[in-house]
């Protein structure tokens, strides 16, 4: 059982990376002198209480920044937010903290991240780029939900 977060870097199929801008994650083309975020991820330790066939339930944070991704409703719309939170505090909770959990599914080199709190909603970036990460349930051309996750050892 791994109980320290793993680190990874993420880009989408258009080779855009995640960058932190004013406490918001945006996807931008990789350039010189740019510092993409390093992702911290750790599997939920209560996997036996979560659905088995949707992927590996993980907490997703920004390495070294005490910020974690979470899903919350604004009005009727599930939204993706960054919250100040220690990923290990979430990991150690006595129950899964669903608002901070994502089902991580891998198909070949592609990864998707589905909200546990809002099944059917996925982390996505607009195909236009330079836009904040969002949650979407429309897995079409307007948004990219497939990401390349490279683990850093």
């Amino acid at each position: 059982k791994i109980d320290t977060p793993q680190r990874g870097s993420i880009q989408d199929i258009n080779h855009r990376v995640w960058v932190l801008q004013d406490q918001t994650l945006i996807a931008v083309p990789r350039k010189d002198r740019m510092s993409p975020v390093t992702i911290a991820l750790i599997s939920c330790r209560h996997v036996e209480t979560l659905e088995k066939d949707r992927g590996n339930p993980i907490y997703l944070g920004l390495n070294g920044l005490n910020l974690c991704l979470m899903c919350a409703k604004v009005g009727d719309q599930p939204t993706l937010q960054l919250k100040e939170k220690d990923i290990m505090d979430l990991y150690n909770q006595p129950e899964p903290v669903k608002s901070f959990l994502f089902y991580h599914s891998q198909s070949g080199r592609n990864s998707t991240f589905e909200s546990v709190a809002f099944p059917g909603w996925f982390i996505a970036v607009s195909s236009e780029g330079g836009c904040p990460l969002i949650l979407t349930q429309e897995l079409g051309k307007a948004n990219t939900t497939d990401f390349g996750l490279t683990m850093l050892f």
Epitope: H46, E48, T49, L50, E51, D89, N92, Q93, P94, E95, V97, K98, S99, A117
Partner: antibody, heavy 121, light 109 residues
């Protein structure tokens, strides 16, 4: 207003089964965890277990495995506790409670009013 | 299975500070036990006070605080009020199951 409304008192015979209900209003049970707790006269509380109504997955205290069965129906926003092979030891008040995460911790934030179960011939 | 022990009864006076404790038969209580504290008033009225050892539930008055004191979890009421007369239960997590204590009957005279 958030409320957990439990079914009324039950008087049942030894060996029988009973199904208690806990109906939520003001929130959706699939967005939280529902816990069941037993309180015998002049005794403390005992954790029976919990259900995640979103997926039906349960956890039981080993002591109640085989005795208690927790289920939930999200369409009626109701959680259920079934108790089988009843004996006088099952005479107690049974509570449902919401176990909710706020900000940094889980809390028991809302409780039902309790259902009194009396097992007697 | 672990046994969680609390004082059976305590008495305090209005305005005084009182501390209730919660001991584990398995050894020292730690933050990994995620102590919860619950108040029971007459007519089966339960209120969650503390979660995660020391985090006050939303809406709970600031006079209630949770902590670890020595090898036990503790609930401190700073400036007790007559309406704090109740039974207080602690609950500790052990891996994937929860164990409640027997409760402390607090009298505020």
């Amino acid at each position: 207003e958030v409320q957990l409304q439990q079914s009324g008192a039950e008087l049942v015979k030894p060996g029988a089964s009973v199904k208690l209900s806990c109906t939520a209003s003001g929130f959706n049970i699939k967005d939280t965890y529902i816990y069941w707790v037993k309180q015998r006269p002049e005794q403390g509380l005992e954790w029976i277990g919990r259900i995640d109504p979103a997926n039906g997955y349960t956890r039981y205290d080993p002591k109640f495995q085989g005795k208690a069965t927790m289920t939930a129906d999200t369409s009626s926003n109701t959680a259920y506790l079934q108790l089988s092979s009843l004996t006088s030891e099952d005479t107690a008040v049974y509570y449902c409670a919401r176990y909710e995460y706020y900000d940094s911790s889980f809390y028991f934030d809302y409780w039902g009013q309790g259902t009194t179960l009396t097992v007697s011939s | 299975q672990a046994v969680v022990t609390q004082e059976s009864a305590l008495t305090t006076s209005p305005g005084e500070t009182v501390t209730l404790t919660c001991r584990s038969s398995t050894g020292a209580v730690t933050t990994s036990n995620y102590a919860n504290w619950v108040q029971e008033k007459p007519d089966h009225l339960f209120t969650g006070l503390i979660g995660g050892t020391n985090n006050r539930a939303p809406g709970v008055p600031a006079r209630f605080s949770g902590s670890l004191i020595g090898d036990k979890a503790a609930l401190t009421i700073t400036g007790a009020q007559t309406e704090d007369e109740a039974i207080y239960f602690c609950a500790l997590w052990y891996s994937n199951h929860l164990v409640f204590g027997g409760g402390t009957k607090l009298t505020v005279l």
